[in-house]
Amino acid sequence: TQNKALPENVKYGIVLDAGSSHTSLYIYKWPAEKENDTGVVHQVEECRVKGPGISKFVQKVNEIGIYLTDCMERAREVIPRSQHQETPVYLGATAGMRLLRMESEELADRVLDVVERSLSNYPFDFQGARIITGQEEGAYGWITINYLLGKFSQKTRWFSIVPYETNNQETFGALDLGGASTQVTFVPQNQTIESPDNALQFRLYGKDYNVYTHSFLCYGKDQALWQKLAKDIQVASNEILRDPCFHPGYKKVVNVSDLYKTPCTKRFEMTLPFQQFEIQGIGNYQQCHQSILELFNTSYCPYSQCAFNGIFLPPLQGDFGAFSAFYFVMKFLNLTSEKVSQEKVTEMMKKFCAQPWEEIKTSYAGVKEKYLSEYCFSGTYILSLLLQGYHFTADSWEHIHFIGKIQGSDAGWTLGYMLNLTNMIPAEQPLSTPLSHSTYV
């Protein structure tokens, strides 16, 4: 008689990352009997929702249902039908929705209500949609990468099973760059965290972690660009803005009303004698870098040391995983290799930004012009943020690892969020037989 394969005893979970520029759906899978083990959850699918972030639906909420359909239907296909009713679905919205809430709590609530209505009508175990805090976003990103890197495992290994593993239990710091905010999270070395808002205490798998985190709202790459434009147009002599962060020959018309739509540009807002202005690229890395530095107020620090804008930042410690837009931008620029020094990155950026727009368009014919046009700014911004904002140096640059995926799972906050909400990160080290835990992150 043939042995029949027993049905897989697995569980699934779905997290939607409702970011400022787009929404992505992630499907995770794990063996049911190993829920409390570290490193057993892995991503089986990512589905990028077509269209902008959910905050852009504020005037067309009736379109949210259609917007989410394709990826939710994909989830129905990927997850076995017998598991649908038991599969939790979570939606976390980040800085795009934080900004909308700052403008109008009522409008943000309406968007979330309609998102929830749409997601509730699928046959999964929908657990609600919410705007996560910047602190959560940083913390869950840190949990994700360290979980995937095996840093919470008590078993020390003589061999490396994942890239970047330094064969010790020192956790990695997490650097996350989105469209509207950026997060820095790490365990400082024997340093008291001087501002309580930036301090997190975790007990994970029997070990205590004192973690520093901060989320800089308005310092994601898209909002930083809006800030820079709003700052620079203040001193423009007419409706032409000669911009070093765009390639020579690049031209784009910007509506002043769009520029001042976001709360991030309020501090630069002024009455301008025109409704539109034209960006004309001049492609100069050094000037672009200088312009970006003006977004960081480093003149004021009420602590022993700061990042910028008076925000406490302890001395950097250990290795860092830089993911999300840090990775996507650097990957496009072919600058993610461990071997590329900071000086080399700067050199490459100088060359890239100086390339004429027509040449760039020809070289990258398959890339949407909207995205293509902004890589010079984004790359320069990443360098400025890491070096002047967070105080990385040419020497400590080698401790930054640009990470897209670890073990097939995307680096980002979503996995950590799900692990926490499904109680899969025990406070104590599990025994060989799973225990029921009452204390979680």
Partner: antibody
């Protein structure tokens, strides 16, 4: 356990208005939406509208001009106001809890409150 | 508005029968259909959602099927306590709409 209890029904004159209440227990209005559905004598069910957990509302367009749904989370109560009543508004009015957070199908219904529009 | 049509207003059945109640949508509603049971003097009770998913606590003799425009609620082994009105409901788009109902009676 989950319960919804409607009140406020009775006899109303044509052209008048009614205000129905739905007191809920066993769940929080900050976690689930509540719909209103009515059933005319010997007829099928007709959806009126919903109030979602953060307070936004959606109405059946056929009632938009004369219907308002509101809630008071602290009193665990949802309200339905219907104006310019007509004879064909005579029905049993139900409030119903969304089966999932904000879904459009219902796992718990109230017992209903009868409204009779008559001169 | 989407019209949900339950063409059989009444159906005569016997205990132990297999009963199929049909519901037709005037346009595609995907699988966004629920079925309710309503006994005289009571409020409706949810049986099926997403066209074919049984609500918790509902006996497994109740099965839903269909997608698009044609939907069926099947009772595989009719019991006397199943004598009731059955309504379908679409929730694919607003306004939410219900079928006119099918009443099960004993032959």
């Amino acid at each position: 356990q989950v319960q919804l209890v409607e009140s406020g029904g009775g006899v109303v004159q044509p052209g008048g208005s009614l205000r129905l209440s739905c007191v809920v227990s066993g769940f929080s209005l900050t976690n689930y939406g509540v719909h209103w559905v009515r059933q005319a004598p010997g007829k099928g069910l007709e959806w009126l509208g919903v109030i979602l957990r953060r307070g936004s509302t959606d109405y059946n367009a056929a009632f938009m001009s004369r219907l308002a749904i509101s809630k008071d989370n602290s009193k665990n109560t949802v309200y339905l106001e219907l104006n310019s009543l007509r004879l064909d508004d005579t029905a049993v009015y139900y409030c119903a809890k969304t089966a999932v957070v904000a879904g459009d199908y219902f796992d718990y219904w109230g017992q209903g409150t009868t409204v009779t529009v008559s001169s | 508005d989407i019209v949900m049509t339950q063409s059989q207003k009444f159906m005569s059945t016997s205990v132990g029968d297999r009963v199929s109640i049909t519901c037709k949508a005037s346009q595609n509603v995907g699988t966004n259909v629920a079925w309710y049971q309503q006994k005289p003097g009571q409020s409706p009770k949810l049986l099926i959602y997403s066209a074919s998913y049984r609500y918790s606590g509902v006996p497994d003799r109740f099965t839903g099927s269909g997608s698009g425009t044609d939907f069926t609620l099947t009772i595989s082994n009719m019991q006397s306590e199943d004598l009731a009105d059955y309504f379908c409901q679409q929730y694919n788009s607003y306004p939410l709409t219900f079928g006119g109902g099918t009443k099960l009676e004993i032959k």
